[in-house]
Structures are given as C-alpha cells and as structure tokens.
Interface confidence: low
C-alpha cells in the first residue's frame, strides 16, 4: 500500500500545481450527491472502495466528523483519516526539525573528530619538541607523551580519568629519564633502580617548579569545557530525536482529522482549513512539546555563554597546541637547577656517589634548533574557536524552534489565506472566529483538557536532562572579562606572568622557539567535515522562489532554504495530496 501511495504522490504532485496555484479559490460547488469526488480521493489514499458510500448516508456511527446532515464518510474511512492525519503530523514535525537536527548531528561528529585531531597535533608537536631539543630522551618521552594524550582523548569523550593524575603521571615518568639522560648521563647501570625514588622526589622537591600545576590548571579547565561542550551537543541531538519521534495522541488525531479531512465528508474537496483554527489545533496537539521551549532557549543561551568563555586557558586548542612549549620550559627549569637537584637527590635517593658525574646542563641555544616548529605558527588560520561561534550563530536562529512549531506547521500545510471562506472543523465559514469555533467544538473535544494533560513522559525526561545540562553549562561558563579564576590566581601563574623568583618565571620559550597561538591548520583532513552548510539537499544557490517559500525566520536558519525544502519535498507534496 505504501508503494501505491508513494506512486500516487508523484502523479498527483503534477496535478497540485493546477489545483492550487496559490490564488483564492472560487466558492466550492454544492456537495456531490453521489459521493463521487470523495470516492476518487479516498481511492488514492486507500485502494479499494468498499468503505466509501455510493451516496450520502446518515453517518450515525461517525465519532469524529459528526455530520449535520447526510455524509460521504463511514466509520472505517474516519479511522483511516485519523491514522493518515497523525502520520502527516509526524512527517511535518520531522521535516520541520530536519535542518536543526542535521546542524547539531553534523557539528557533534565534526567537533569530536576535530578535538581528536587537535590532540593528535598536540602530541606531534610535543614529540617534535623532544626530537629536536632533547634527542636523548626521545624513545621514552614519545611513549609518555603518547600515553598522556591518549588519556586526554578519553577524558574529552567522558572517561572517568583525573586530569591532575594524568599530568602528574607525565612528569613522574619524564623526570627519571631527564635525570638519568640529561643531568647524569654517566650514571652506572647499577644506579638505574632509583626511578621510583626519582618519581617521588619530583613532587617533593618541585623539580619542575610551578609548571606541572600550571599545566594541570590549564589542561583541566580547557578539557572540562570541551567535554561539557560535546555533552551538550549530544544532548541537543537527543532532544531533537525525542521530539522528532513523538507519537501524537488519539485526541490530537481526532482534531487533525476534523481540520484536514472532515470537510470531505460533506463533499467540500477544495476547501482549506482556517489559519486561526489550524493554530488552535496545533497548539493543542503540541502543548507538551512547546513546554520544552523555555529550556531549549536556556540551552542555546547557556551554550553560547560557554562558547564565549572558551578562550585562553579555557580553549583546549590553545592549551594543548601550546603544551609542547610549556613542557620545554619546564625541562629548562630543571636544567637551571641541575646542580642543586643532583646533590639533593643524591642524598635522598642514596645511590653511590663514588665518582662525580658531570652535569649535563648545556646552554639553552645549544639545544634549540631555531627552525623547529616554525611550521606550527600559522597566521590568520581558521580555528575551532571561530567554528564554535559560527555554530552558535546558527543555533541561535533556532532559538524559537519549539514555540514556533505550531505556527510553522500551519504555514507549511494548506490553510486558507486571511481566514476567509475556510473550514473551521464543522462547516465552511465566510470568516473564522475563534470564539464561535470553540463554542461549536465543545461537544466534540475539550481543547483545554487536551492542553492540561501535560507533556508525555519522554518529554518530561528530556526537559529534566535539559535542566541538568543547563545547570552544568552555567557552572562552567566564565565571568566576562576574566580568564583566570580564584584558584589559579592563588596557586599559579598564567603563561607570560612571572613570580618574584626569577627561576619561577614562565615566560619565553627560548631563542627560536615559536609558540603556537591557537592556530590549527586543518588542511585536507578536517576542513571539509567542518562545513556544516553542506547539509543533505543543499544547493549553493537558492532561487528567489525558494526564498519566498522559506520565510519562517524564527524557526530556522534560512541561509540555504533548499536544504529544508529538498528534504521536505516528498513528504510535503504527499501531505498536500493527502489533505487536499
């Protein structure tokens, strides 16, 4: 049957342009005394005519399209109309949310992959720093760096890993290698069992100064924000999916049937529902869904606040891509204090000092290749930061999505212009009056009662999840104009600041060492996947006609109306056909 309906849709699509050129229709002919028109319409909807009366009947068994006189509908037809009306409604809802859904799904996938790539680049930069500046550390350093960045990836994706532990593990692992390879390269093999002691001494003696704490602060803050950003996008998908697949109630089905199909029972094939009446019905049907609106608005605004705060130490791209430089600075700090450290560790870890091991602290410029990592510095390169802001701007065009849904669906289904000569659910009227319509409908359904039922359990659940994520987003959002919070001010430095002790200065990166300033060259591997305008059905040029159709600015982004139109085409054409 579905195949037949689909085929019929395509055939009738051509007829539609003749039936509905968009101008006001002439007054409809009197009801068909033989139900012929109703039979031919219903034949397209449901092959076989056994349910359609040959001539008008009393219709005493009808429950929805209550007749004022003889009717061309039977109870079975009414049931079919109800089913079709609910399916049409579900299709319209899915079409309405398609662009928004794709926007979030695409971005969630893209940002997840992009963050993985940032992590990979950060790892490569850090490895390159070791290879160029400390070749004797490379085999082990590569391993520790790899483990650290694997943990970073897992943390972003929600693993229960403590960031401080990750950073501590990195420095705990690095120090024994630095000590035995750089500071005491002549250390005999018998002394190499001191690694555990060195790991402990690393913390007790603060051998890397304030750098581990600085990295902990920056990494934990930037990764927390990144993680919540991804969680929020994934919840956005869940919200749309939930409302996308709502099953409308029987009450709603009856209201929709009255609006879209009951006119046929009277042989009024060309008449359209009154616009005001459509709005009343849609608000009734979507009362539960519209309750999401308040939390959806808050979600987008909270996400915007989060994104606005994602800079400097709250931007993982900036933090991770600059990590190689901070690690390099931390090793230089160890080397500056090599003499003092060697003596202290010699006493603490009690390895035999039978001969004086030469200290391997060399002048900084001997270690630094002036060309190293110049490739990392890319001017005017598009960053994830700009992509995030772009996403927020697009999302903000959907801020009224839920409150605007009833109006949107009415504007995308056939309704009479100016509420003149239209169907009000009971009869053809010259002009629609909401009060008269409500009075006339009292016996048929209680619209107020339908609204008062409250949202479905799935909607309530998604509202709870939105409340939770909104709270998290608010907690994470940074106060404007402040980058560092109280904790960092009290316990550490921001990169570029210096303490009283010159040794604690976390400033420059050494001659020729070039810091990466929030620049990630996406090149071939990422650029295309970040282009969220490449939505299904998107065409690069929209015709004026397309723009006229997609005029509902409050509901969604209309930069590229063909995106929505193409995806809606089949369902809406079928819907037009099935309704009128």
């Amino acid at each position: 049957m579905a195949g037949t309906v689909r085929t019929a849709c395509l055939v009738v699509a051509m007829l539609l342009s003749l039936d509905f050129p968009g101008q006001a229709q002439p007054p409809p002919p009197p009801p068909d005394a033989t139900c012929h028109q109703v039979r031919s319409f219903f034949q397209r909807l449901q092959p076989g005519l056994k349910w359609v009366p040959e001539t008008p009947v009393p219709g005493s068994d009808l429950q929805v399209c209550l007749p004022k006189g003889p009717t061309c509908c039977s109870r079975k037809m009414e049931e079919k109309y109800q089913l079709t009306a609910r399916l049409n409604m579900e299709q319209l809802l899915q079409s309405a949310s398609m662009e928004l859904k794709f926007l979030i799904i695409q971005n969630a996938a893209v940002f997840q992959e992009a963050f993985e790539i940032v992590v990979r680049h950060a790892k490569n930069y850090t490895n390159a720093m070791f290879k160029n500046n400390y070749p004797s550390l490379t085999p082990q350093a590569f391993e520790f760096v790899g483990e650290f960045f694997t943990d970073v990836s897992l943390y972003i994706l929600g693993s229960d890993i403590n960031v401080d532990d990750m950073v501590n593990e990195l420095f705990d692992s690095l120090f024994p290698v630095i000590y035995t390879q750089l500071m005491n390269p002549g250390l005999p093999d018998s002394a190499l069992d001191i690694n555990e002691c060195l790991r402990g001494a690393r913390r007790d003696l603060k051998v890397f100064g304030n750098f581990p704490k600085l990295i902990m602060t920056q990494v934990s803050k930037s990764l927390q924000v990144t993680r919540i950003f991804l969680q929020a996008l994934n919840l956005g998908i869940e919200v749309i999916n939930t409302t996308d697949h709502l099953k409308f109630s029987k009450d709603c089905g009856r209201m929709l049937t009255r609006m879209w199909y009951c006119s046929y029972c009277q042989g009024l094939m060309m008449v359209k529902p009154c616009g005001g009446y459509c709005n009343v019905v849609m608000q009734g049907c979507m009362a539960g869904v519209v309750e999401i609106d308040k939390y959806w608005r808050e979600y987008i605004l909270s996400l915007e606040e989060l994104v606005n705060g994602m800079y400097r130490i709250y931007d993982m791209e900036n933090v991770l891509l600059g990590l190689f430089s901070t690690i390099h600075d931390s090793i230089q700090y160890v080397q500056k204090n090599a003499g003092k450290l060697t003596t202290t560790i010699g006493k603490l870890c009690a390895h035999s000092q039978q001969r004086q091991y030469r200290s391997a602290y060399y002048p900084e410029d001997l270690f630094i290749d002036k060309k190293v990592l110049k490739v990392a510095h890319v001017e005017h390169e598009e960053t994830l930061s700009s992509r995030r802001r772009e996403l927020i701007q697009k999302l903000k065009s959907f801020i009224s999505f839920y409150s605007a849904l009833p109006g949107y669906i009415c504007s995308h289904s056939p309704v009479a212009e100016n509420d003149t000569l239209c169907w009000n659910g009971q009869e053809l009227v010259e002009r629609y009056s909401q009060k008269a319509a409500r009075n006339g409908m009292k016996n048929q359904f209680n619209l107020h009662e339908l609204k008062m039922k409250g949202p479905e359990p799935v909607v309530s659940q998604i509202i709870d999840k939105l409340k939770h994520i909104n709270q998290l987003l608010r907690t994470m959002s940074m106060p404007k104009g402040r980058v560092l919070d109280k904790n960092l001010d009290e316990e550490g430095f921001e990169s570029g600041d210096c303490g009283d002790d010159e040794d604690e200065c976390i400033g420059g990166s050494g001659d020729g060492m070039i810091k990466v300033k929030n620049q990630l060259r996406f090149l071939a591997e990422l650029a295309y996947d970040l282009d969220v305008d490449d939505a299904p059905g998107n065409s690069q040029q929209a015709t004026p006609k397309d723009n006229e159709i997609s005029t509902f600015h409050n509901l969604g982004n209309v930069h590229s109306p063909l995106k929505l139109l193409t995806s809606m085409a089949i369902s809406v054409v079928c819907f037009f056909f099935l309704v009128h």
Epitope: T150, D534, A535
Partner: antibody, heavy 116, light 105 residues
Framework: DVQLQESGPGLVKPSQSLSLTCTVT?????????WNWIRQFPGNKLEWMAY???????SYNPSLKSRISITRDTAKNQFFLQLNSVTTEDSATYYC?????????WGAGTTVTVSS | QIVLTQSPAIMSASLGEEITLTCSAS?????MHWYQQKSGTSPKLLIY???ILASGVPSRFSGSGSGTFYSLTISSVEAEDAADYYC????????FGGGTKLEIK
C-alpha cells in the same frame, strides 16, 4: 614500513559469528590514526564497516551496528572484527586498513564464504 | 546516508587518450577521495581530499570537483591504468561509489 594482514576462517556457517584479526607491523596502532574494517562483496561493491581509533574509540556503520564489534590488543598490535548472526549476504573479501578520513594503507584481504 | 553514483560503470579508452571518471553525491560533500583497484589486489589510494595526489601516484592522474559533483581525470591513459576506480566520502560515515571499470582498447 607499515603493513596490515588479515586472518580468519575462510568458511562460516549461517547464524554463526565471524571473527577476523588484523595484524599490524611497522606501526603502533596506539600512535595515531584509525584502524578500519572494509569489505568488498562479490559484485565489487565496497562497504566500510567499522573503525577503532588509536585512542580506543570505536565507530560502526549504522547498518551493521546491532551485530558488529571491533576490539584490539595493543600488546600484540592487532585489532579484531566480530560479526554476529552472519548470513550468505555477508560473504565477501574483508580488508583491514589504516586511516581517518581516507584509507592510505590496506591489507591484502581475506575471503570469507558464508555457507552451510 | 550519502549515496555516491559513479559513471560510467564501464569505460573503454585508447592508449594516450584523456578520460574523465565522475562521482556524483546524493547530497553535498566537501571532499572526495579516489581509489584504484587492479584485479586480485586491494584498493590503492590514488587521490585524497579531492585533488591531492597520494605518494607515488603518477602526475597524469588529477582530481577536481565540489558540492555534489567530483571527477578523476587521466590525462594520457596507459596500459597499467586498466582497473576499477572508486570514490569515497565521509560526512557522517564513509561510503564508496559503485565503481567505474576502465578497460584499455
């Protein structure tokens, strides 16, 4: 030089599970990139099935998601495919490959026939 | 799911001839990758990110395109180019085209 080699049974009975192994040499599967399974049906149609990223994150083709699993053994530098409830439609040449956005290195492939 | 349609399904070319294989996407994609598969071997990366030649690929191969239409051009066909050619995209997950078989006359 990185090399990938697939291994597994050539013949599987319908409704049983298919298990394949990809052994990687010359490159650590935890260093970077993604490690994929792709199959090619007798008519030469190619289908991406799944990947496991260097960090352990997995992704599956939605059409197979309910019956597919990809895992790895980092110590042996191997990754694995398990496809449950196979039918004759799953008869194909199965390839493992490396790559995120595209696949730059492929194994030679292993042919699997599903038949009773 | 994005569907990639390659045309023609089979192409016959003479040595030295310039030919173009096309790949059409059901929805807009931003990049396309191309593979060559010779009989009895696994696919080999030919071009990635629409137009970048993979390592060791002769310069007679080139790629171009945008949106929903992409092409692979061989400027002067050689006997060793007889093979199946596939396009690949990834937006939400990866899909391959149905392939074009290139035969040499």
């Amino acid at each position: 030089d990185v090399q990938l080699q697939e291994s597994g049974p050539g013949l599987v009975k319908p409704s049983q599970s298919l298990s394949l192994t990809c052994t990687v040499t010359g490159y650590s599967i935890t260093s970077d990139s993604a490690w994929n399974w792709i199959r090619q049906f007798p008519g030469n149609k190619l289908e991406w099935m799944a990947y496991i990223m260097y960090s352990g994150i997995t992704s599956y083709n939605p059409s197979l998601k309910s019956r597919i699993s990809i895992t790895r053994d980092t110590a042996k530098n191997q990754f694995f495919l398990q496809l449950n409830s196979v039918t004759t439609e799953d008869s194909a040449t199965y390839y493992c490959s490396r790559g995120y956005w595209y696949f730059d290195v492929w194994g030679a492939g292993t042919t699997v026939t599903v038949s009773s | 799911q994005i569907v990639l349609t390659q045309s023609p399904a089979i192409m016959s070319a003479s040595l030295g001839e310039e030919i173009t294989l096309t790949c059409s996407a059901s929805s807009s994609v931003s990049y396309m990758h191309w593979y060559q598969q010779k009989s009895g071997t696994s696919p080999k990366l030919l071009i990635y990110s629409t137009s970048i030649l993979a390592s060791g690929v002769p310069s007679r191969f080139s790629g171009s395109g945008s949106g929903t239409f992409y092409s692979l051009t061989i400027s002067s066909v050689e006997a060793e180019d007889a093979a199946d050619y596939y396009c690949l995209q990834w937006i939400t997950y990866r899909t391959f085209g149905g392939g074009t078989k290139l035969e040499i006359k």
